[in-house]
Structure formats: structure tokens, C-alpha cells
Interface confidence: low
């Protein structure tokens, strides 16, 4: 039985040219995380964190994506095209797969506030 909950940074905003941390956290389960996949709104994979092999950043994002903190992902040099949904997929044993959603809005305004509260989707 899957008892866990994915908490995410929810809906966040950040300014163009800046950076943002995408963070998911798996709680309320003793399951062990074997792999975390990070996907963009068009379902293209940004990065993978494998328990054995460590981080793999996909070549198309190498210049703008940094691993961490933790199992999270840091997006840098944001553009307006980065606006949209991001998904974290946690592969765990023995529970199976958990999925979390984050919506990022990239703002032109220099006064854009970067909110990073944790939410349960």
C-alpha cells in the first residue's frame, strides 16, 4: 500500500534571467528512493538522480540545470519559455512510483517575488 505523500514547492514564480529551486519531498513512508526523474512540461526529461549512479543531467539542459539541493533541481538563466509544469517522479521500493507537480511562472518584472513554500498537491 502506498502511504507516502509528495510535498512540492507548489506554484512558484521567479524572474527572467534568475534561478529557481525545484524541490519535492517524499514523506509519511519508510520506502527507499531508488531513482528520481525530473521532467519538463512537454514531458522531456531534465535530469535523473539514480541511487547508484548519481546525477545525470540531459545534454540539452547541461548549461542551465544544476543538481540539488538534495534530490531537487536548480534551474538557472531562466527564460520565458521555462514557464510551465515540472514533474518529479520518485521510484521507490516497496511502494512503487510517486509523482509531484510544480508550476513555475517566469516573470519579466524585476520585482518578481520567488515564493518557495511547500505544498501538498
Amino acid at each position: 500500500m502506498m502511504t507516502g505523500t509528495i510535498e512540492t514547492t507548489g506554484n512558484i514564480s521567479a524572474k527572467k534571467g534568475g534561478s529557481v529551486i525545484l524541490q519535492c519531498h517524499l514523506s509519511s513512508t519508510m520506502a527507499q528512493v531508488t531513482q528520481v526523474n525530473w521532467e519538463q512540461h512537454d514531458h522531456s526529461l531534465l535530469a535523473i538522480r539514480n541511487a547508484e549512479l548519481g546525477w545525470h543531467i540531459y545534454p540539452a539542459f547541461k548549461d542551465r540545470v544544476a543538481p540539488g539541493p538534495g534530490l531537487g533541481l536548480t534551474l538557472q538563466s531562466l527564460t520565458m519559455n521555462d514557464t510551465g509544469e515540472y514533474f518529479c517522479t520518485y521510484h521507490t521500493y516497496p511502494d512503487g512510483t510517486y509523482r509531484g507537480r510544480i508550476f513555475l511562472e517566469v516573470l519579466e518584472s524585476s520585482v518578481a517575488e520567488h515564493s518557495a513554500r511547500f505544498q501538498i498537491p
Partner: antibody, heavy 125, light 106 residues
Framework: QVQLVQSGAEVKKPGASVKVSCKAS????????IAWVRQAPGQGLEWMGW????????NYAQKLQGRVTMTTDTSTSTAYMELRSLRSDDTAVYYC??????????????????WGQGTMVTVSS | DIQMTQSPSSLSASVGDRVTITCRAS??????LNWYQQKPGKAPKLLIY???SLQSGVPSRFSGSGSGTDFTLTISSLQPEDFATYYC????????FGGGTKVEIK
Amino acid sequence: QVQLVQSGAEVKKPGASVKVSCKASGYTFTSYAIAWVRQAPGQGLEWMGWISAYNGNTNYAQKLQGRVTMTTDTSTSTAYMELRSLRSDDTAVYYCARSGSSFWSGDVLGAFDIWGQGTMVTVSS
Amino acid sequence: DIQMTQSPSSLSASVGDRVTITCRASQSISSYLNWYQQKPGKAPKLLIYAASSLQSGVPSRFSGSGSGTDFTLTISSLQPEDFATYYCQQSVPPRTFGGGTKVEIK
């Protein structure tokens, strides 16, 4: 064909160190992890740890922490296992093995699908 | 760490016999269970991965089943080359092996 070839047998004195090599061929070395497993004479198999050939990420068995170091040389597709402060109970055959998990499986299955031939390490005064 | 208990530790059988080896995990490991065969003086060989998947090149007389905590390796009709020691291994970090089952000629 896919294979792992290990260095030859070693005889060491207590307190010394040993470094065993494991050369991979026939597959993309950096797409997998290399695990090390040892087997004392007449005993079962003991997992020692692994190293990612992709980025050097390591995970060691708790009982060996501080005494073991695993490294890779991607230019020669070779993995190394160094064990320090050797004791008589470290006498064993040491195997390297390819861990079948990869980034593309979407999961850690982690079966050891390819094994080296083994390296006998004898620790004796 | 997860403990793996294999039984029996040894067994005697004849060519053509159906042989069953069991492996029990101290906690649920889903299907993260592999089986290996080892002959004297040789490296282990992977037979079954993910509890029931047959490794390429392994004869179909070998099969695996189970999930959670209880697993079974079955050899449907024992052949002369099957006399060896068999190990289960759970592949949840940190890896642990069962104690082994030696299959001997009766």
C-alpha cells in the same frame, strides 16, 4: 564480448594495503556502476560497495567504511578497489561485477549481470 | 540492513529431479531479488533478476517466483551441470546475499 578482467592474486602482510583492478570491455563503461563482492574461503558472498563509472559516486558497506576506497579510470575503463589495514579475515576472493541498473531502466534493479574472474587476496604474517 | 535467509543450506538430488530453493527477506523488498549460481573456483553467474526474469542465455528449466518477503528458485529438471551453490541477493542498497544453498548429487 562483454567482460571484466581482474588483476592477479596477491599475498599481503597484516596492516598492509591491497589494490585490485578490474578492466571492462565490450560495453559503455560509464553507463553502469561497478560493484565489489568478496568471498572468504568456504563462505558466502559479501557485498562491499559500488562505484558509479559515470561520476564516481560511491556507496560502501558500513563494516568497511574508512578502510575501502573504490575508484575508476574512465580513460582505460578500469575500476579499482583498495583495502587498507588488512587483517587475516580479509583473506578472500575479491570479485568485481557490473551492476545492471542504469539511468535508462527507470529503477534500480541492481542485479550483478557480469562478473570478473576473481582475485585471491591472502593476508598472512 | 535487510537480512536474507536461504533454505535449505544444502540438499541432495538426482538428475531429473525438481528442485526448489527458498529465500526469505527480513522486510518487504518488492521484486528486488536476484538468483545466482556458483561453481567451485568460478565467479557467480546471474540466473534470475527482479524475482522472476530469466537472464539471457540461462536455460528455461530455471524459474523464479515471489514478491514481498518470500521467494523461490525452481529447477524443473535437474541436469548434471546444475550441481552448484545457489545464492539469492536483494538489490536494495545496501545489497545483501543469502547464505547459499549447495545442491549435491544424491
